[in-house]
Each structure stands twice: as C-alpha cells, then as structure tokens.
C-alpha cells in the first residue's frame, strides 16, 4: 500500500510542477521593472521568455513578441530551450508513468515492467525537474548581471531593446513559479524511483511448479521469481506464475486456468 | 463613445471643501481605464489632479495630495473629487477626463467653473 | 516633477502655411521597454475643453486630420500643423505621461496671420 501511495504522490507531484513549468514557460513576467525607488509608476515594463509588456497605469497594456530568431541573445534562447526540454521530458515522463501506476491495472503488465516504467518516469521527472531550474536559474543570472550595470545604453540581454539607465530589471513571479515548479517535479521524480524500488519483484530460491489438468505437455519452471532489478531487498514477494501475474497485496482475486501448488 | 459630465456648486467658501461630481455614460467606470480630474484658472495652464483608475486605485498630484480626494461610485458610475480647505488659488475650470493609451486624457467633460469667493 | 516648456508661447501663421510648435522636458520621456515616448499633444479653442491630438509623439488620435503630425524623442518634441486652417486657431498644449504627476507645458496659442 505504501508503494501504490507513493508513487500516486509521485505522480501527483510532478504533474503539479510540470504544469507549473508549463505555466512558467508561458508567462510575461520573467522579469518585471525595478521599482525601489519609485514604487507608483505610469509606465511599467515587463518581460518574458517570448514577448515583452508595457503596462500604463491608465490600463492599457501592449506586448510585443521577439519576431527575431538569430537576433535574439544566446543566453535567453538557452533558457527558452531549457524551458522546452524540461517540458517535453516532463510530458513524456507523465505518460509513461500513468502506465506504470499500480493502481492502473493494463492486461497483464509484469510488476517488473511496471517497476522498470516507475524508474524511467522517475528519472525523467529528475531531469524535467533540473532543467526547469537551471532555466530560472540562468535568467536570474542575467537579470542579477544587467541589475549592477549602470551604463546609459545597456544592453538588456533580453530582446535586444536598448535600455536606458533608470529602468532596471528584477526577478519576475515566472522565475519563482518555475523554482518550484522545478522543485516539484525534482522531488516527484525521486518518489517515483523510491516507488520503483517497492515494485521491484526480489530474487528468492524458491521454485516454482505450475500443473495443468489437460493432458498436453505442461511446462516445469524452476526460479519461478523473477530477478530483481536490484534495488535493495524488497517487502513484498510478488510470485510470477506462468498462467498470469498476480500479486500477494492484490484484494480482488482473478481465477486462473492454472492450479497454483 | 464615453461622455463624462461634470457636475457640483459653482461656488464654494474659503476653507471649505469642493466637492465636485463626474457622471460617465457610454461606458463603465470599472473598465480599463483611469478617470481624471484636471483644473485649469482662468486664463492660464493645465494642472493635472489626480485619478481613480479601473481597479479602485487612487494617484494624485503630490502638490494638492494632503488636500484631495478622489473616489467612485460603481453602482451609479460616477467618481467623485473632493479638494479641502480652498483658496482663491483653486478657482479654475474643473474637467474629469478619461485616461488610456498612452496615459493621454482621450476624453473630456465640457467642465465646470468653481470659484472660490467669500 | 518633469517640466515641460513649450516654445514659442504664441505663433502667427498665414493660412495654408506650416506652424511648429516646440515641447522640451527636463527627463527623458522614452519607455525602454517598448521605445515610445509618453507625449501627448492637445488642442484647445475657447469655452471648450481640450481634445486630444497625438499621443506617444506621434501617433495621431482616431479622427484628427492629417496635417496634424507630431515628431520627437528623449526630451524634445515638435507639433507640426502643415498647412494651417482657420479651424485650427487654438492653444496647443503638450503633456508627459511618463512620469508622476504628469505634467502639461504652458500652451502655444496659434493665430492667423
């Protein structure tokens, strides 16, 4: 039961951090104007990985896309493909791992392919996880770089727009979202390869005989267990017969054209 | 089209409070706009006052700021300045205007003439 | 407070003739973040409350003649009426809308010549 929960957990989890960098990835304020010094203004600057927003205390608010592709600074087309890579690994991670769910009964899937799917969602989620966060991460650098430059013209880093000295730029609610959107799925990941490790079926010395009433020849298999996958020892024995796999924590029973000894 | 009217006594004591009132039609003051209040004395400049804008938030100009007030009425769409303790000097041609790209006053009311006499 | 000067304070044109008004603030009204300058140009006739003409400096309000343009950016900003009509006898006022509390200049009065 603890392993269906924390892989349920799991799964949960990181559904909510990738939605999250999801909704990072989408979002117009990476960075918004700093506005320490002035903190009622009549214009204010924002801006995303996509498209940069001015926002005129009267309410209009115009936003403009980056139409430039090469013209655009390699840092922010880093981030934007951090961004993409996390979610695409993400997206990926949460389809295989709705496979692998426990409690999600698909023909008859070995607990060993299902331990196998657990890890490698969980492993994805990990890396989805981790490139959201070096995303954010690197975008804050820049926006830390650009904050101490006082040049007239700087050069923003984000767009190419030029910039002059009195509008400066901090960290935008889409760097926080995507730390913990990034934290989620990190953390989902690593419940899922936990999860991975109580699915696993362990080695034992046990044998196994399965008959069979008819008369046709019947099929003698010793080490009946399947091998482990080698993540430590494991609580529940999880007998794989050759008339279909049925697991000891299972509450309803399916009846078998074998006979079990 | 927003039309906005002006409306208040045209005369008002030293020392009392002006209180002044903006009816719009055509539109709704919860929109995305900001709605303003500018004087202009006889003869002279444009001062802007200060506005209410669509999310209730109130902006004046630090020059009258101890001395006004602006709010709205939603159910009856109008906004409201008050400007306490006047002079002669606050005698001038009160307009409410709206306020949206470009934070340009697109539309005005005719205004309304306060004059600040004993 | 941003100070806006207009210049010069009254202007006689002949009709049909060009008249440029001049704005100059003491900061910059350009917004980095999308490159438009917060200046608006207003015409106003007696008795009548001002209209609006141009804003961000050169974009001209919907139903404002053409020969109404406006150019400039930074700190200095220029009306231009190409080919001046009776109608167009007025006060012609320029406002940032850059920075609190916005601020108009003085007014230009244009007359016929």
């Known amino acids: 039961m603890a392993v269906t929960a924390c892989q349920g957990l799991g799964f949960v989890v990181s559904l909510i951090g990738i939605a999250g960098i999801i909704a990072a990835t989408c979002m117009d304020q990476w960075s918004t104007q700093d506005l320490y010094n002035n903190p009622v203004t009549a214009v204010f600057n924002y801006q995303g990985l996509w498209r940069s927003c001015v926002r005129e205390s009267s309410g209009f608010t115009e936003c403009r896309g980056y139409f430039t592709l090469l013209g655009l600074p390699a840092m922010l087309q880093a981030v934007r493909a951090l961004m993409i890579v996390g979610i695409v690994l993400g997206a990926i991670g949460l389809l295989v791992s709705i496979f692998a769910l426990k409690c999600i009964r698909i023909g008859s899937m070995e607990d060993s392919a299902k331990a196998n799917m657990t890890l490698t969602s969980g492993i994805m989620f990990i890396v989805s996880g981790l490139c959201a966060i070096a995303g954010v991460s690197v975008f804050a650098n820049m926006l830390v770089t650009n904050f101490w430059m006082s040049t007239a013209n700087m050069y923003t880093g984000m767009g190419g727009m030029v910039q002059t000295v009195q509008t400066r730029y901090t960290f935008g609610a889409a760097l926080f979202v995507g730390w913990v959107a990034g934290g989620l799925t990190l953390i989902g990941g690593v419940m899922m390869c936990i999860a991975c490790r109580g699915l696993a079926p362990e080695e034992t010395n046990y044998k196994a005989v399965s008959y069979h009433a008819s008369g046709h020849s019947v099929a003698y298999k010793p080490g009946g267990f399947k091998a482990s996958t080698g993540f430590g020892s494991n609580t529940k024995n999880k007998k794989i017969y050759d008339g279909g796999a049925r697991t000891e924590d299972e509450v309803q029973s399916y009846p078998s054209k074998h006979d079990y000894v | 089209q927003v039309q906005l009217q002006e409306s208040g006594p045209g005369l008002v004591k030293p020392s009392e409070t002006l209180s002044l009132t903006c009816t719009v039609s055509?539109?709704?003051?919860?929109?995305?706009?900001?709605w303003n209040w500018i004087r202009q004395p006889p003869g002279k400049g444009l001062e802007w006052i200060g506005y209410?804008?669509?999310?209730?938030?109130?902006n004046y100009n630090p020059s009258l700021k101890s001395r006004v007030t602006i709010s709205r009425d939603t159910s009856k769409n109008q906004f409201s300045l008050k400007l306490s303790s006047v002079t002669a000097a606050d005698t001038a041609v009160y307009y409410c205007?709206?306020?949206?790209?470009?934070?340009?006053?697109?539309?005005w009311g005719q205004g309304t003439l306060v004059t600040v006499s004993s | 407070d941003i100070v806006m000067t207009q210049s010069p304070d009254s202007l006689a044109v002949s009709l049909g003739e060009r008249a440029t008004i001049n704005c100059k603030s003491s900061?910059?009204?350009?917004?980095?973040?999308?490159?438009?300058?917060?200046l608006a140009w207003y015409q106003q006739k007696p008795g009548q409350p001002p209209k609006l003409l141009i804003y961000?400096?050169?974009t001209r309000e919907s139903g404002v003649p053409d020969r109404f343009s406006g150019s400039g950016s930074g700190t200095d900003f220029t009306l231009t009426i190409s080919s001046l009509q009776a109608e167009d006898v007025a006060v012609y006022y320029c406002?940032?809308?850059?920075?609190?509390?916005?601020?108009f200049g003085q007014g230009t009065k244009v007359e016929i010549k």
């Open positions: 961000w400096a050169s």
């Open positions: 406002q940032q809308a850059y920075s609190f509390p916005w601020t």
């Open positions: 205007a709206t306020s949206y790209y470009g934070n340009s006053f697109i539309y």
């Open positions: 900061q910059s009204l350009l917004n980095s973040g999308n490159q438009k300058n917060y």
């Open positions: 209410i804008n669509y999310s209730g938030n109130t």
């Open positions: 055509g539109g709704s003051i919860s929109s995305n706009y900001a």
